[in-house]
Interface confidence: low
Amino acid sequence: RLSPEYYDLARAHLRDEEKSCPCLAQEGPQGDLLTKTQELGADYRTCLTIVQKLKKMVDKPTQRSVSNAATRVCRTGRSAWRDVCRNFMRAYQSRVTQGLVAGETAQQICEDLRLCIPSTGPL
């Protein structure tokens, strides 16, 4: 399990993003999003934390500058966090880079990744 410190770190990066998970994980049987408010999924929190860190690390987001920052973003913090961070970046670095270069907010990027649990997604 992730440590309380991990969640504290995540919350610190979430002040603007607030409080329930807008992506809501899965679509209902008719294609409508399920509308119950959910706690933020851990993956969603991880995403916001990492994307906001990356934003701070690059002045002007370009493919190269974001890619360079991505190699460093998981180096700080406790080892449990570093593992979580590296696993996330392995899966989603290309989308995160694309979003940052395009000027998307952390919330837009992470919401669009549908990282609440379970991430069923469409075809």
Partner: antibody, heavy 117, light 112 residues
Framework: QVQLQQSDAELVKPGASVKISCKAS????????IHWVKQKPEQGLEWIGY????????WYNEKFKGKATLTADKSSSTAYMQLNSLTSEDSAVYFC??????????WGAGTTVTVSS | DIVMTQTPLSLPVSLGDQASISCRSS???????????LHWYLQKPGQSPKLLIY???NRFSGVPDRFSGSGSGTDFTLKISRVEAEDLGVYFC?????????FGGGTKLEIK
């Protein structure tokens, strides 16, 4: 990297059942749904349904209810699809796939099922 | 179920030409969340389909910029600005706004 390895081709008799597998590797199996898609020779694609191994949720295309049964074994990171009461209409290639909203799209190589007496 | 109608069924082109494939849905594909879940795939013989474009106009990772998607509501288009040999195969559109998620019948891009 993420891979979905499907079981080998099957030749089965009309009326029989077949169970095909899709073994996932390179990611946490319980984090993402596995979808199944049917493709008849030289034809289009049909979505059969999906299973969420994390919580056991299964959604089916109404057309395949009773025909397909989706299951998953977390211990072996393997999804299964059983097809029942087979007819020649069920002869097709069946693909499993993992999808994560467009940014991560991985398909198995497909399993060919041939129904013939 | 949403019916996805692709035209043409077959599209003969010369290498270097522009190609355009149309996909029309029987109902609007605008989701209640504002997104339009219309995607394009390419399938080569003996292979599984590969995602090219997701949500109307977003190129999937690694897809060359000669591929572009456009459209809204019920009418969508995939354009290839300069066809290369590796682009030949069957193109499918797919919608995931409404369950069951459905595919077009396919358009075969082939050499003239």
């Amino acid at each position: 990297q993420v891979q979905l390895q499907q079981s080998d081709a099957e030749l089965v008799k009309p009326g029989a059942s077949v169970k095909i597998s899709c073994k996932a590797s390179g990611y946490t199996f319980t984090d993402h749904a596995i979808h199944w898609v049917k493709q008849k020779p030289e034809q289009g694609l049909e979505w059969i349904g999906y299973i969420s191994p994390g919580n056991g949720d299964v959604w089916y295309n109404e057309k395949f209810k009773g025909k397909a049964t989706l299951t998953a074994d977390k211990s072996s990171s393997t999804a299964y699809m059983q097809l029942n009461s087979l007819t020649s209409e069920d002869s097709a290639v069946y693909f499993c796939k993992r999808w994560n909203y467009g940014y991560f799209d991985v398909w198995g190589a497909g399993t060919t099922v041939t129904v013939s007496s | 179920d949403i019916v996805m109608t692709q035209t043409p069924l077959s599209l003969p082109v010369s290498l270097g030409d522009q190609a355009s494939i149309s996909c029309r849905s029987s109902q609007s594909l605008v989701h209640s969340n504002g997104n339009t879940y219309l995607h394009w795939y390419l399938q080569k013989p003996g292979q599984s389909p590969k995602l090219l474009i997701y949500k109307v106009s977003n190129r999937f990772s690694g897809v060359p910029d000669r591929f572009s998607g456009s459209g809204s509501g019920t009418d969508f288009t995939l354009k290839i600005s300069r066809v290369e040999a590796e682009d030949l195969g069957v193109y499918f559109c797919s919608q995931s706004t409404h369950v069951p998620w459905t595919f077009g019948g396919g358009t075969k891009l082939e050499i003239k």
